[in-house]
């Protein structure tokens, strides 16, 4: 018995070869002996039933002269999975057709962190195995159901699933979109008084995007978090629903989601969590955003540099006179110099030598007041 594997919705070619390599009488039948089609000596294809019943069944007339009489089944259905009989030259050839299909659970657009289930639709009697390869090259193997938990952004793209049955293979391609922000987390470093821009670009594009979102903010100095802004998203248009009075945030009307804080102040330093709930999706997209604010001040004989907000313990805060070695350098959130000499002082926040934030303060000779450029 010859085995042919097919994909639902596509076409399958069931072989039937003559030993004489020339046109001959042949008939294709179902296993219950109902005729499908055949050629009875006049080179004309005769169908075994009404056109509506048999319009998916065909043969390759061009191959008949070469002694090949295939049965073509178009728009394959699961129910086509059965044994077909080719009768020619007083012999019967049995061809088993198995139709398969691989589908993704309910939706191919899934939120980051959710699970993807790939299901193999297979006919009774088959004993397939499936191996699926993710866009990042990760292989998963199993029976008729495969699950991948905790989807990541790199899982977006084309998944290739190979169904193996009796050493024969059939391949399926499924496009999966992982709905997520481009970055899970970001940090904005600003000097006190500067305008702050927060951007939340999405890692996917869809025709219509509808949902609602909110930015909760936990200021370092505050005991509890507070909702800064809530908004709606309709067909990629952003409309603000509610915004806090302090700070006075502004939000862009188009994607990517964009928020502007007029001034970076120490009382705003902290971390926020932007959540976006998409229509018809369970769960939410999240992006963490952090704001670090720097202030350099001179009070009497004390030059101080401070940072507020979520800084890593490995960050270095330094005070140095321009073009000179650092006077003070500590893994702390505040440094100071007593009786600083006159000149342009720099306050630097750095990570392994890379400057993240810089604030300059001019120290005048002792008879005058300091100037902040």
């Amino acid at each position: 018995k010859t085995l042919v594997l097919g994909k639902e919705g596509e076409s399958a070619e069931l072989p039937c070869e003559s030993s004489q390599k020339k046109i001959t009488v042949f008939t294709w039948k179902f296993s219950d002996q109902r005729k499908i089609l055949g050629q009875h000596g006049k080179g004309v294809l005769i169908r075994g039933g009404s056109p509506s019943q048999f319009d998916r069944f065909d043969s390759k007339k061009g191959a008949w002269e070469k002694g090949s009489f295939p049965l073509i089944i178009n728009k394959l259905k699961m129910e086509d999975s059965q044994t077909y009989i080719c009768e020619l030259e007083n012999r019967k050839e049995e061809v088993e057709l198995w139709v398969f299909k691989v589908t993704a659970n309910s939706d191919t657009h899934l939120l980051q962190g959710q699970s993807l289930t790939l299901t193999l639709e297979s006919p009774p009697g088959s004993s397939p195995s499936v191996q699926c390869r993710s866009p990042r090259g990760k292989n998963i193997q199993g029976g008729k159901t495969l699950s991948v938990s905790q989807l990541e952004l790199q899982d977006s793209g084309t998944w290739t699933c190979t169904v193996l049955q009796n050493q024969k293979k059939v391949e399926f391609k499924i496009d999966i979109v992982v709905l997520a922000f481009q970055k899970a987390s970001s940090i904005v470093y600003k000097k006190e008084g500067e305008q702050v821009e927060f951007s939340f670009p999405l890692a996917f594009t869809v025709e219509k995007l509808t949902g609602s979102g909110e930015l909760w903010w936990q200021a370092e100095r505050a005991s509890s978090s507070k909702s800064w802004i809530t908004f709606d998203l309709k067909n990629k248009e952003v409309s603000v629903k509610r915004v806090t009075q302090d700070p006075k945030l502004q939000m862009g009307k188009k994607l990517p989601l964009h928020l502007t804080l007029p001034q970076a102040l120490p009382q705003y330093a902290g971390s926020g969590n932007l959540t976006l709930a998409l229509e018809a999706k369970t769960g939410k997209l999240h992006q963490e955003v952090n704001l670090v604010v720097m202030r350099a001040t001179q009070l009497q004989k004390n030059l101080t540099c401070e940072v507020w907000g979520p800084t890593s313990p490995k960050l270095m805060l330094s005070l140095k006179l321009e073009n000179k070695e650092a006077k003070v350098s500590k893994r702390e959130k505040a440094v100071w110099v007593l009786n600083p000499e006159a000149g342009m002082w720099q306050c630097l926040l750095s990570d392994s030598g890379q400057v993240l934030l810089e604030s300059n303060i001019k120290v005048l000779p002792t008879w005058s007041t300091p100037v902040q450029p």
Epitope: M78, T103, G125, S127, G143, K144, T145
Partner: antibody, heavy 125, light 107 residues
């Protein structure tokens, strides 16, 4: 533990309808293909229907085609068999059963390993 | 459809003895073949699948053999709990079909 519990059986007149349910517990129902199998009184076993884990691939034995409908609700961990135009010969104990598999290297072996206790359907005037 | 024929229809064996049950398929079913045990008022219990693989929790005294069209279930040393009806089943072609059963009785 893994359990399948059938319900919905009863006495019905010829031409009538019944809906059988099978409640699954102790496993991830949505991962498994499911089946209905029946056994007429004092007789052997007959496979009735087969449904894939997603519910989109369905097969029936010829004697019930057009009269019975198999379905599933993965959110409710339930398998159903809607039986219409019932005949006397449909009288039987109806079992729901789970298709399991084991694998050796790249080869997968499928078998019906877990069965419910059954529910009795009697079609009589 | 594939017809499964079991023999004998009934078999009387004494406890401790060996029992051999046969099943023939009307056409090849490869090794997609199973044996079930059924006791009165209970659901069938899977003993053997893939013609020769014992299901989980099935004692080693049960063994299956064969492929294609001829299959055998052997119970090496019968215990009192083994007296029941045994069914063979093919799952190579739809519809899946069962044999008519072999009743194993105490002699």
């Amino acid at each position: 533990q893994v359990q399948l519990v059938e319900s919905g059986g009863g006495l019905v007149k010829p031409g009538g309808s019944l809906r059988l349910s099978c409640a699954a517990s102790g496993f991830t129902f949505s991962d498994y293909y499911m089946n209905w199998i029946r056994q007429a009184p004092g007789k052997g076993l007959e496979w009735v229907s087969y449904i894939s884990s997603s519910g989109s691939t369905i097969f029936y034995t010829d004697s019930v085609k057009g009269r019975f409908t198999i379905s599933r609700d993965n959110a409710k961990n339930s398998l159903y068999l809607q039986m219409n135009s019932l005949r006397a010969e449909d009288t039987a104990v109806y079992y729901c059963a789970r298709e399991d598999y084991s694998n050796y290297e790249d080869y997968y072996y499928y078998y019906t390993g877990v069965w419910g206790k059954g529910t009795t359907v009697t079609v009589s005037s | 459809e594939i017809v499964m024929t079991q023999s004998p229809a009934a078999l009387s064996v004494s406890p401790g003895e060996r029992a051999t049950l046969s099943c023939r398929a009307s056409q090849s079913v490869s090794s997609k073949f199973a044996w079930y045990q059924q006791k009165p008022g209970q659901a069938p219990r899977l003993l053997i699948y893939n013609a020769s693989t014992r299901a989980t929790g099935i004692p080693a005294r049960f063994s299956g053999s064969g492929s294609g069209t001829e299959f055998t279930l052997t119970i090496s040393s019968l215990q009192s709990e083994d007296f029941a009806v045994y069914y063979c089943q093919q799952y190579n072609n739809w519809p899946y079909t069962f044999g008519q059963g072999t009743k194993l009785e105490i002699k």
